[in-house]
């Protein structure tokens, strides 16, 4: 997989600051590169905008726990 | 339909008030926070106030800090500005918008209402 | 307050022109910048957010680039619908600004 090696890392250099609507949230990915000042985890919208946000906080813990569960429940 | 719809503008005199509205619908209104941006004529943008999904949060440009009040209604899907004390200076059209989130930043504007003109003139 | 100046304050270019234009902040933005389109009479309207994102169903020939102060919006091939005001606007701290704008005439 050459590609995914070589891909350029998406980096976060502030976080918002404001608590994101989880309805609002489709999925997010976790930025641990030793290439970027700092972890982060950045969030993909419904309408597939990125948000970098801090792991550290409550609400970034909690909606990524709610979008955990949201792709282990099979849909009907 | 995804839109704003703006109402309350007009002619005012100075040190007087007056209140626009903005109606949302085609989203969830609740989710996003809101700002006002405003233009005077002839003149480039100016953001003038937000709040944050909940109306907990807000925030202002100095110069209408203490005169101007932004508040929300998620139960009617509104926006509102309370201006008083108004000055020529505040002479200007007023747009309501929908406020992002950037990667590296908040506060950019994807849906815009089609602005109310606000005149401050004796 | 970030201060945003861009230049030049109005162009005349044709149908075709590759046109670029430029927004420098009076401090870092990181990539906390967004690009609007206004037509006379008419609200603004996103192209360009995060300094590069194109904004949903705006034409491929809008590009944004640039981080730190300087930033350019390029429009590959102008229309004629391009001929408008164009304003940036950073998003990386209070009170969010505006640029002065650049008017894009025919020539």
């Known amino acids: 997989q050459p590609d995914a090696i070589n891909a350029p890392v998406t980096c976060c250099y502030n976080f918002t600051n404001r608590k994101i609507s989880v309805q609002r949230l489709a999925s997010y990915r976790r930025i641990t590169s030793s290439k970027c000042p700092k972890e982060a985890v950045i969030f993909k919208t419904i309408v597939a905008k990125e948000i970098c946000a801090d792991p550290k906080q409550k609400w970034v813990q909690d909606s990524m726990d709610h979008l955990d569960k949201q792709t282990q429940t099979p849909k009907t | 339909e995804v839109q704003l719809v703006q109402s309350g503008g007009g002619l005012v005199q100075p040190g007087g008030s007056l209140r626009l509205s903005c109606a949302a619908s085609?989203?969830?209104?609740?989710?996003?926070?809101m700002s006002w941006v405003r233009q005077a004529p002839g003149k480039g943008l100016e953001w003038v106030a937000n709040i944050e999904q909940d109306g907990s949060e807000k925030y202002y440009v100095d110069s209408v800090k203490g005169r101007f009040t932004i508040s929300r209604d998620n139960a009617k899907n509104s926006l509102y500005l309370q201006m008083n004390s108004l000055r020529a200076e505040d002479t200007a059209v007023y747009f309501c918008?929908?406020?992002?989130?950037?990667?590296?930043?908040?506060?950019?504007?994807?849906?815009w209402g089609r602005g109310t003109l606000v005149t401050v003139s004796s | 307050a970030i201060q945003l100046t861009q230049s030049p304050s109005s162009l005349s270019a044709s149908v075709g022109d590759r046109v670029i234009l430029t927004c420098r902040a009076s401090q870092g933005v990181s990539s906390a910048l967004a690009w609007y389109q206004q037509k006379p009479g008419k609200a603004p309207k996103l192209l360009i957010y995060d300094a590069s994102s194109l904004e949903s169903g705006v034409p491929s020939r809008f590009s944004g680039s640039g981080s730190g102060p300087d930033f350019t919006l390029t429009i590959s091939s102008l229309q004629p619908e391009d001929f408008a005001t164009y304003f940036c606007q950073q998003f990386n701290s209070y009170p969010l600004t505006f640029g002065g704008g650049t008017k894009v005439e025919i020539k």
């Open positions: 085609g989203f969830t209104f609740s989710h996003y926070w």
């Open positions: 918008a929908r406020d992002l989130e950037g990667l590296h930043g908040d506060g950019y504007f994807d849906l």
